[in-house]
């Protein structure tokens, strides 16, 4: 059964700034990645970023960069301007569309006692929701 | 258009150390991950490691490690490889590679000979 | 790190042939996996990307297929262009390893 992890992470470097992490575990061939945040796409998330094997990347303020770091998985910088986008406690989701299995998502979070710069290992989280 | 120039054919003595470029035109190399890889006569490749450019954070093969040190300068939109204490070992092809706007190898450079014979 | 072993390391065909190469990872990675092509002289190219995808530009003779620890890729109808080296890769995880190569040449 494919998996999706979500990891959030804040940078040690800049406070301000935050790395979602996702990935995908699975058979099948990735077609896009949509990354949003305040809950899953389509169900009251906000789009932060699409990435297309084929056609590259897109990503809306206040995401910096979406990149993929290999075949199935991708990551999204953001820069936090302050209280108007509290990060710390955003919840952040990952959907995956691959052929032939379909879309599968899953959401995570910036652990409450994380420390800057650290967090465990990208582990397979419960999918939330797959179409 | 994009392109990855790297630096011309170097030949460097055993123990020496050298740096090889990778210049990037077309796009923002903090936009991907510059990865560099190895490539001895008839033989295969080998992956070095990769650079997220934006911080400096690197990853690299553990049989690279102390060998070799990517750097990236974003003001100038060059990556850079550093390999010490060369040996004959070290004499190959190098080339750079981005990643990270599509999940694959897209653009890789010309590559650079490096020769270690004394 | 995972090893991608490649096999033959070497084709001999005549124009037209069919021709078969094999990669096998010592462990699952999935789709993660790429075929390139390396003309003499020249940089890779890549192939076909999530094991079965072609890449842009890429004619239809060259497919791949495979999923998990067992991975194929074909030209269905050899090309005199087709002379090169053919890399399997995985980036499934790091560090990322390529399989030894296979050189074809055409008769």
């Known amino acids: 059964t494919p998996e999706v992890w979500v990891q959030v992470q804040m940078e040690a470097t800049e406070l301000s700034s935050f790395t979602v992490h996702c990935g995908f575990l699975g058979p099948g061939s990735i077609s896009l990645v949509t990354v949003s945040w305040g809950g899953p796409d389509g169900a009251g998330g906000t789009k932060l970023a699409v990435l297309h094997p084929e056609l590259g990347t897109r990503q809306w303020a206040p995401a910096r960069q979406a990149r993929w770091e290999t075949q199935s998985s991708i990551s999204l910088a953001l820069e936090d301007s302050g209280a108007s986008s509290p990060f710390a406690n955003t919840t952040f989701c990952c959907k995956f569309a691959s052929f032939p299995e379909g879309s599968w998502e899953s959401c995570g979070s910036l652990p409450p006692s994380s420390d800057p710069g650290l967090s465990a290992p990208p582990t397979p989280v419960p999918i939330l929701r797959a179409d | 258009e994009v392109q990855l120039q790297q630096s011309g054919a170097e030949l460097v003595k055993p123990g020496a150390s050298v740096k090889l470029s990778c210049t990037a035109s077309?796009?923002?190399?903090?936009?991907?991950?510059m990865h560099w890889l190895k490539q001895r006569p008839e033989q295969g490749l080998e992956w070095i490691g990769r650079?997220?450019?934006?911080?400096?954070?690197?990853e690299y093969d553990p049989r690279f490690r102390g060998k070799a040190t990517l750097t990236a300068d974003t003001s100038s939109n060059i990556a850079y490889l550093q390999l010490s204490s060369l040996t004959s070992e070290d004499t190959a092809v190098y080339y750079c590679?981005?990643?990270?706007?599509?999940?694959?190898?897209?653009?890789w450079g010309q590559g650079t000979t490096l020769t270690v014979s004394s | 790190g995972i090893v991608m072993t490649q096999t033959p390391k070497f084709l001999l065909v005549s124009a037209g042939d069919r021709v078969t190469i094999t990669c096998k990872a010592s462990?699952?990675?999935?789709?993660?996996v790429v075929w390139y092509q390396q003309k003499p002289g020249q940089s890779p190219k890549l192939l076909i990307s999530?094991?079965?995808n072609r890449y842009t530009g890429v004619p239809d003779r060259f497919t791949g297929s495979g999923y998990g620890t067992d991975f194929t890729f074909s030209i269905s109808t050899v090309q005199a262009e087709d002379l090169a080296v053919y890399f399997c890769?995985?980036?499934?995880?790091?560090?990322?390893?390529f399989g030894g190569g296979t050189k074809l040449e055409i008769k």
């Open positions: 590679a981005r990643f990270g706007i599509y999940p694959y190898f897209d653009y």
């Open positions: 077309g796009f923002n190399i903090k936009d991907i991950y």
């Open positions: 650079i997220d450019p934006t911080n400096g954070n690197s």
């Open positions: 462990q699952s990675v999935n789709k993660a």
């Open positions: 999530y094991a079965s």
């Open positions: 890769q995985q980036d499934y995880s790091s560090p990322w390893t």
